[in-house]
């Protein structure tokens, strides 16, 4: 789903059931530690020397919802995610490097501790390079492993 041109409000489709208080995980992995802002995430990535994984999504997007379920239920993904600084966002940041080919959701991007956006780590869709679908969990795992191999930075 492309969020560049926002369609009309979709409050009519919102689930009316009472929910537990929303945590920073927003359902992407309640046992994981999530950062609140992009700025905080960049700082933590740099100081901890851990790569940053950023998930852009929307509550009212069926593909965000579907990917969230497989992400949260996949034990390998959840285990590997512990090695990252984690951020999930339901809004766009001002950093254009995080939307090199558009502001669609869901999309997952990685940032090296050197604060380089890993635009080279892509999914399987040529028209939406950073999109992942539920069938793409193996590829996402591979890409997480790629991101853990940190870029060499000159001292």
């Amino acid at each position: 789903r492309d969020t560049t041109v926002k369609p009309g409000a979709k409050k009519d489709t919102k689930d009316s059931r009472p929910k537990l208080p929303q945590t920073l995980s927003r359902g992407w992995g309640d046992q994981l530690i999530w950062t609140q802002t992009y700025e905080e995430a960049l700082y933590k990535s740099k100081t901890s020397n851990k790569p940053l994984m950023i998930i852009h999504h929307l509550d009212e997007c069926p593909h965000s919802q579907a990917l969230k379920k497989v992400f949260a239920e996949n034990k390998e993904i959840q285990k590997l995610a512990e090695q990252f600084v984690l951020l999930n966002l339901v809004y766009e940041t001002t950093d254009k490097h995080l939307s090199p080919d558009g502001q669609y959701v869901p999309r997952i991007m990685f940032v090296d501790p050197s604060l380089t956006v890993r635009a080279d780590i892509t999914g399987r869709y040529s028209n939406r390079l950073y999109a992942y679908e539920p069938a793409d969990t193996a590829l996402l795992l591979d890409n997480m492993k790629k991101a853990l191999k940190l870029l060499k930075t000159e001292l």
Partner: antibody, heavy 120, light 107 residues
Framework: QVQLLESGGGLVKPGGSLRLSCATS????????MNWIRQAPGQGLEWIGW????????NYNGKVKDRFTLSADKAKNSVYLQMNSLRAEDTAVYFC?????????????WGQGTLVTVSS | EIVLTQSPDFQSVTPKEKVTITCKAS??????LSWFQQKPDQSPKTLIY???RLVDGVPSRFSGSGSGQDFTLTINSLEAEDAATYYC?????????FGGGTKVEIK
């Protein structure tokens, strides 16, 4: 193989309530989205909503949100559609349809449907 | 909500002929479109998902194409058993919406 079996349809008076069931088998129930779709006599198809049985998350078509409620019972591998304040225009065949086997949103398997008639 | 406009509404075709049904979305839906076949007094059967992926067990004479707003279902060499109503569905955005249907009749 995958099987979906709807039940609970029948004749109900305007303003009445009905609870439809969709019994499933042949796949991991908790990890596929389940949709409800209806088809008025001689008409096209209309999506009602979906539920993720693993945690009960739902989304509804705004047209029915205030009157219809989806739920799931993991012990019985069944999903339910509770319909309240029924109107004549709710008369239709109601289908449950499973999402993709991998958790994708596309509709992969359909039940045979159950007819709901709202009439006085 | 996203509106899907199917055309034609009705098509009368001779066996072995090629059938083309189009579905136009009111906005970009990427490739999140499915095609279904429904015969009288039966439930719909899924033929195609993600615009061009054939569901297991569906004959290869069925194919789908398109992305963005314009999509096509093609039946190469129509068979008598293909007489049915065909629907498209977008699942890019809530609420999911269906096209109005195309009835294919055998001459």
């Amino acid at each position: 193989q995958v099987q979906l079996l709807e039940s609970g349809g029948g004749l109900v008076k305007p303003g009445g309530s009905l609870r439809l069931s969709c019994a499933t088998s042949g796949y991991v129930f908790s990890r596929s989205w389940m949709n409800w779709i209806r088809q008025a006599p001689g008409q096209g198809l209309e999506w009602i909503g979906w539920i993720y049985p693993g945690d009960g998350d739902t989304n509804y078509n705004g047209k029915v949100k205030d009157r219809f409620t989806l739920s799931a019972d993991k012990a019985k591998n069944s999903v339910y559609l509770q319909m309240n304040s029924l109107r004549a225009e709710d008369t239709a065949v109601y289908f449950c349809a499973r999402g993709g086997y991998d958790g994708s949103p596309w509709l992969s398997y359909w039940g045979q449907g159950t007819l709901v008639t709202v009439s006085s | 909500e996203i509106v899907l406009t199917q055309s034609p509404d009705f098509q009368s075709v001779t066996p072995k002929e090629k059938v083309t049904i189009t579905c136009k979305a009111s906005q970009d839906i990427n490739s999140y479109l499915s095609w279904f076949q429904q015969k009288p007094d039966q439930s719909p059967k899924t033929l195609i998902y993600r615009a061009n992926r054939l569901v297991d067990g569906v004959p290869s004479r069925f194919s789908g194409s398109g992305s963005g707003q314009d999509f096509t279902l093609t039946i190469n060499s129509l068979e008598a058993e293909d007489a049915a109503t065909y629907y498209c569905l977008q699942y890019d955005e809530f609420p999911f919406t269906f096209g109005g249907g195309t009835k294919v009749e055998i001459k």
